[in-house]
């Protein structure tokens, strides 16, 4: 047997050497034919002469006395050698214009060449097969065809690729999908049905490669073909738009010198669409920038987002502007299967500065020392400033308001802050100031409801004091009542000022009412022993918050604070 | 922003029927399905049932199959659970939840409504 | 069905605390978990989907991480609005299954 094999080898060579002295249409390596097949599954491979090369089938050449013969190179090597169509259970068999194998092996690797030829004729092409390896994942260095789904749109299917011709139509094969190593069953949103895989909606989670193995039975034995195919999710062309271009726009204008280097992006969003070309282009003075004599660069990027829609960006530069490049009109332009839209950027000389003399700016100089020191002086001294001025030339507010209180006191109802508000707050705020407050459980009568009389009292008063503590924002108490009431207010109808006083920091908190009001409103903070002292900051910021009212109570110490002697006992 | 309010629960005897609605306000439902999810008193979150916003197929618990009905009334963006032969071990609150159409995941929920199955 | 197992069923913390709760699912669901909060009388909150991806809108003190089968929720610095209880959610195969919650409480 094997010498027979040597014989047929020897005399095969000798076909070939022959055939290169006569003359036979080469269509060499065909490249673009790269045929990767898994080891141990069956593989046919048809010649692609007939495919691709010449224009008639194998049935007509048959019929026409032309002979298909098969011959490969193994991996690494040179040698053209006969394929042996004798193996054990017929391993590598030739149908017709097929080349089959039952099933492949690891070291079937290699390129094939099918010629056709008779006496008078001959053509020939090789294409190059892997055999390659896969684990239990179905990983393996294979190129995988990608399928694209769109998401927001409904049930989709993907088929089994490349089994058709393996077993006949009265065959029926058992298909197993996998979503990457899972076995497809009850699947939230992908249904197996037979050769298809039903995607009843397609989200983002679903990108991934998915394989099916077809099971069937042939001449006493089960083969297995595995396909794997990448599911990539697109966005929907139900969802799909017309370019955008976000740059350049109307806000932004480019203004720039003879001299200096000009800069443009385009920016342009393109919504997926299958098989569409996304193009952006500049025009200047409505040619492109190669159709004129100015020294133009575009570099382009491309960004796409998780279900492929397109981001890209042309920018435009030219080193060395000149003053006639400043006048020219510099057009975007994007087009796609949707539409076509363009956008002109606003291009502009910059104005040169005139030229100062030194007096000129020695008087700059002097007016900018000036005003920093104006700043300095109101940025130490505001408070002082502006409690002068309520003194002296303040309206009073209170008059004729319809109010009954200056201040109604929100408070965590807890021992310490009780403590705050009932002998410091009141103490000071009532006895020095002159202020009349609105503390709920000193003013309210008994037996009343709550959120009634609440409402009410902040109705009457012209500010809301709220007393900031970690207790503060416990869900659910009467103090957020108040706050939500008194922003309420004063978001509405716009009757009453809310005046945060942080007794204690509250870290973060999920009250949305208070994150709101802490970021519009500016919070004043007590700092313990620091803050009692009369000239302190916190008495002052205090006073600035309140109406404006002119009270017989209060004296010209007003000006400088308060008296140290009604703190001291607090 | 989408907000889904549930409706229709209430007391009723066993072997009786109810009528869950959810609807949907500030907006359309979207997403990828619509989900009902209960939740017995003191108990744990069990799925339901959904209804595809595309094809509206539908997808039972067994332990409601054959009793439960899930629709949709796109034109009123409202969701329904058609309840019949109510038993005792139904009792629970009755969520509706949006699946989100990029991701597996619940991303808006109802306030729930209250379902009592007693004699 | 898949079970879904959390663990603990209680945890007692306290504010500042790093808070760690697992999920294990009876078979592999790939990264197609979620994870929610649920307050007492209110809906769930979606914190995490995808296993590990951070739902809009939620502090970063959360998140979460796995695949497979064994999956973590994580809270980095537990807040005092944070005491709740937390489900985890798979979404991979139907019926959807939920674990029957872990209780995070004050200690």
């Known amino acids: 047997m094997t010498l027979l094999w040597c014989v047929v080898s020897l005399y095969f060579y000798g076909i070939l050497q022959s055939d290169a002295s006569e003359r036979c249409d080469d269509w060499g390596l065909d490249t673009m034919r790269q045929i990767q097949v898994f080891e141990d599954e069956p593989a046919r491979i048809k010649c692609p002469l007939f495919e691709h090369f010449l224009k008639f089938n194998y049935s007509t050449a048959h019929s026409a006395g032309l002979t298909l013969i098969w011959y490969w190179t193994r991996q690494d090597r040179d040698l053209e050698e006969p394929i042996n169509f004798r193996l054990p259970e017929n391993r590598i068999s030739k149908e017709k214009d097929v080349l089959w194998f039952r099933p492949t092996l690891l070291n079937d690797t290699g390129n094939y060449t099918c010629m056709l030829r008779n006496t008078t004729y001959c053509s020939k092409v090789a294409f190059p097969l892997e055999v390659v390896q896969k684990d239990s994942c179905f990983n393996s260095p294979m190129k995988l065809p990608v399928h694209k789904l769109y998401i927001e749109y409904g049930i989709q299917r993907i088929t089994c690729p490349n089994v058709d011709g393996y077993f006949p139509s009265s065959v029926k094969p058992t298909i197993t999908w996998y979503m990457g190593c899972y076995k497809i069953q009850n699947f939230n949103n992908v249904i197996p049905e037979g050769m298809n895989l039903s995607f009843l909606i397609a989200l983002i989670s679903n990108n991934g490669n998915y394989t099916c193995v077809v099971t069937y039975p042939e001449n006493g034995r089960t083969f297995h073909l595995t396909r794997t195919l990448t599911v990539k999710v697109v966005g929907s062309p139900k969802n799909a738009v017309p370019p955008v271009i976000h740059s350049p726009n109307d806000h932004v204008v480019y203004e720039k010198e003879p001299g200096e280097e000009l800069l443009i992006p385009c920016t342009v969003y393109f919504s997926f669409l299958m098989d569409s070309r996304n193009e952006v282009w500049w025009t200047i003075d409505g040619k492109k920038p190669d159709d004129i004599t100015i020294d133009v660069t575009i570099n382009e990027s491309i960004s796409h987002s998780r279900t492929e829609d397109e981001t890209r960006t042309q920018i435009l530069s030219i080193k060395k502007v000149t003053s006639e490049d400043l006048k020219r009109s510099y057009v975007c332009h994007a087009r796609s299967a949707k539409g076509e839209v363009a956008k002109a950027a606003k291009v502009k000389q910059k104005v040169p500065a005139p030229r100062y003399t030194v007096e000129l700016a020695c008087g700059f100089g002097a007016t900018v020392l000036l005003v920093v020191i104006l700043i300095v002086v109101y940025h130490v001294y505001w408070l002082e400033m502006v409690l002068f001025y309520r003194a002296h030339f303040g309206t009073d507010e209170t008059i004729l308001d319809g109010k009954e209180y200056d201040i109604y006191v929100s408070y965590a109802r807890n021992a310490e802050e009780e403590e705050f508000v009932l002998l410091t707050l009141r103490g000071v705020l009532e006895n020095e100031f002159g202020y009349k407050l609105c503390i709920f459980d000193r003013d309210s009568l008994p037996g009343g409801i709550v959120t009634d009389e609440t409402l009410s009292f902040i109705q009457k008063s012209r500010r809301l004091l709220v007393v900031l503590s970690p207790n503060y924002v416990l869900q659910g108490t009467q103090a957020l009542l108040e706050l939500k009431a008194g922003l309420e207010n004063m978001a509405s109808r716009g009757n009453i000022n809310v005046i945060l006083v942080q007794y204690k920091a509250v870290k973060e908190t999920k009250v949305k009412e208070l994150k709101r009001a802490k970021t519009v409103l500016t919070v004043i903070k007590w700092k313990g022993e620091k803050s009692k002292y009369p000239q302190g900051r916190f008495w002052k910021q205090l006073q600035v918050a309140m109406p404006v009212k002119k009270s017989p109570r209060r004296s010209s110490s007003d000006e400088q604070g308060l008296s140290y002697s009604s703190l001291k006992n607090v | 922003e989408v907000q889904l309010v549930e409706s229709g629960g209430g007391l009723v005897q066993p072997g009786g029927s109810l009528r869950l609605s959810c609807a949907a306000s500030g907006g359309t439902f979207g997403g990828s399905a619509m989900h009902w999810v209960r939740q017995a008193p003191g108990k744990g979150l069990v799925w339901v049932s959904r209804i595809l916003t595309y094809g509206g197929i539908a997808t039972y618990a067994e332990s409601v199959k054959g009793r439960f009905t899930i629709s949709r009334d796109n034109a009123k963006n409202t969701l329904y659970l058609q309840m019949n032969s109510l038993r005792a071990e139904d009792t629970a609150v009755y969520y509706c939840?949006?699946?989100?159409?990029?991701?597996?995941?619940?991303?808006?929920w109802g306030q729930g409504t209250l379902v009592t199955v007693s004699s | 069905d898949i079970q879904m197992t959390q663990s603990p069923s209680t945890l007692s913390a306290s504010v500042g605390d790093r808070v760690t709760i697992t999920c294990r699912a009876s078979?592999?669901?790939?990264?197609?978990l979620a994870w929610y909060q649920q307050k007492p009388g209110k809906a769930p909150k979606l914190l995490i989907y995808?296993?590990?991806s951070l739902e809009s809108g939620v502090p970063s003190r959360f998140s979460g991480s796995g695949s497979g089968t064994e999956f973590t929720l994580t809270i980095s610095s537990l807040q005092p609005e944070d005491f709740a209880t937390y489900y985890c959610h798979q979404l991979l195969i139907y019926p959807h299954t939920f674990g029957q919650g872990t209780k995070v409480e004050i200690k």
């Open positions: 078979q592999s669901i790939s990264s197609w």
């Open positions: 995808d296993a590990s």
């Open positions: 939840a949006r699946g989100s159409s990029e991701y597996p995941k619940f991303d808006i």
